[in-house]
């Protein structure tokens, strides 16, 4: 569950996230799994680690395999694996399934493609964007921070686009490149006030002491694309980002999607080891968009073991 | 609340509204107006634990809700006035279960405060 698929290209920098998150002040191992060798932290290395992150500057088709994370607090101990796959670049102008990231959707109003895992590096602006190989020229194109927007999009707009950016570490750069397709939605699209579906208001979820737990916060937001909508989880009125628990972790991403033609997004809120204090919690589950606000909280309850007698 | 006045046209004010007698944090506050003759209308909300703002569409742009949550107070900063802003202006509060500029998720309301704009 713990496990993420990363890739990237030889002689290009990657850099990867330890699948299990914890506060900043916590310490984070690295593993490769095949050996259990331990990877150093010391920056003078072509491979090495840096708290959550496992920097590959450059990366070498030699350095694909399964790298194990263990971060470590005073109390606990969580342990994440990244399953690394490093390709040769390819000679041709074809970007391989296995290469591409997930792919995106736009319509005439909302043309956004974001450059992924681009978050990951410390790169400038600005960024450069290429559709099938071809750099992209004209005023319909604007990079704009970590993405692309196209004017007045079009079906011939659908391809595939690759963004290339420089990672700069310590004074030495290195080249970095995506790339995700491109799907143009020709339908007229609606959007209406968000309508949740899942959790219900006030719903009791039975959980069990000890046990990991899921909540998943489900709404649609009306038909085709939608712009500005969004859904996500709260503690006690807090970001869970803010809250400081490492056990309960919000999904990264958000899942879309289309539901009897309705466009859905959703969020899964993870509980490792339930622990009586979270008992206590009101889960929000918000949804968001141009129309506004929508909440429906949660509240955990302790499941009772089934007596079995003789 | 407070803030409200007279200005030119083109001119900005700024509207507070201090909030007690009710948990602000989880709430949804927003700002009406109802200029005479007119039914009332939403011009903006903000969701308080996280600060998402919501806007009419006739003061996007020109309108910025905004929060202090140590002062339990909510802002509305009015740029680029028109005379069609004049207006006596509301605060309201409501539970969050829903936040927009509807006022029907709202349940606490202000007393209101002047703004009028001149050409």
């Known amino acids: 569950k713990f496990s993420k698929q990363s890739w990237g290209l030889e002689n290009e920098a990657l850099i990867v996230r330890c699948p299990r998150q914890g506060k900043p002040s916590y310490t984070v191992d690295w593993y490769y799994s095949q050996t259990n060798k331990s990877i150093p932290t010391q920056e003078r290395n072509r491979v090495f680690a840096s708290g959550q992150l496992l920097k590959f500057l450059p990366a070498a088709v030699a350095d694909s395999g399964i790298y194990t994370c263990i971060v470590r607090s005073p109390t606990f101990n969580r342990t994440g694996y990244a399953n690394v796959t490093i390709y040769k670049k390819q000679s041709d102008c074809n970007v391989p399934d296995y290469l591409m990231y997930s792919t995106v959707s736009g319509s005439e109003k909302n043309s956004k493609i974001y450059c992924p895992t681009i978050d990951l590096y410390n790169w400038t602006a600005p960024l450069e964007w290429f559709k099938n190989c071809q750099a992209l020229q004209g005023s319909r194109y604007r990079a704009h921070k970590s993405f692309l927007v196209i004017d007045n999009v079009m079906t011939e707009d659908a391809g595939d686009y690759t963004c290339k950016f420089i990672h700069n570490e310590n004074g030495a750069n290195y080249s970095v490149t995506a790339t995700r397709s491109f799907t143009v939605k020709d339908e007229q699209g609606f959007s209406l006030f968000p309508v949740i579906g899942a959790p219900a208001q006030n719903e009791i979820k039975e959980v069990e002491i000890g046990k990991n737990a899921n909540l998943t916060c489900s709404a649609c937001f009306g038909k085709g694309t939608q712009f500005l909508a969004a859904v996500l989880w709260q503690l006690n009125g807090t970001k869970i980002t803010d809250f400081g628990e490492p056990r309960i972790q919000q999904e990264e991403g958000q899942n879309q999607s289309f539901s009897n033609g309705l466009a859905c997004l959703d969020m899964v809120l993870r509980i490792a080891d339930v622990k009586e204090e979270d008992l206590l919690l009101q889960y929000d589950c918000l949804a968001l968009n141009l129309h506004g606000l929508r909440r429906h909280t949660v509240r955990l309850s302790r499941k009772n073991p089934i007596d079995h007698h003789s | 609340e407070s803030g409200g006045g007279s200005v030119q046209a083109g001119g900005s004010l700024r509207l507070s509204c201090a909030a007690s007698?009710?948990?602000?944090?989880?709430?949804?506050m927003g700002w009406f107006r109802q200029a005479p003759g007119k039914e009332r209308e939403g011009v903006a909300a903000i969701y308080t634990s996280g600060g998402m703002t919501f806007y009419d569409a006739s003061v996007r742009g020109r309108f910025t809700i905004s929060q202090d949550n140590a002062k339990n107070t909510v802002y509305l900063q009015m740029n680029s006035l028109k005379p069609e802003d004049t207006a006596t202006y509301y605060c309201?509060?409501?539970?969050?279960?829903?936040?927009?500029?509807?006022?029907?998720?709202?349940?606490?309301w202000g007393q209101g405060t002047q703004v009028t704009v001149s050409s």
């Open positions: 309201a509060a409501g539970g969050g279960d829903y936040c927009a500029t509807n006022a029907r998720f709202f349940n606490y």
């Open positions: 007698g009710f948990t602000y944090r989880r709430a949804c």
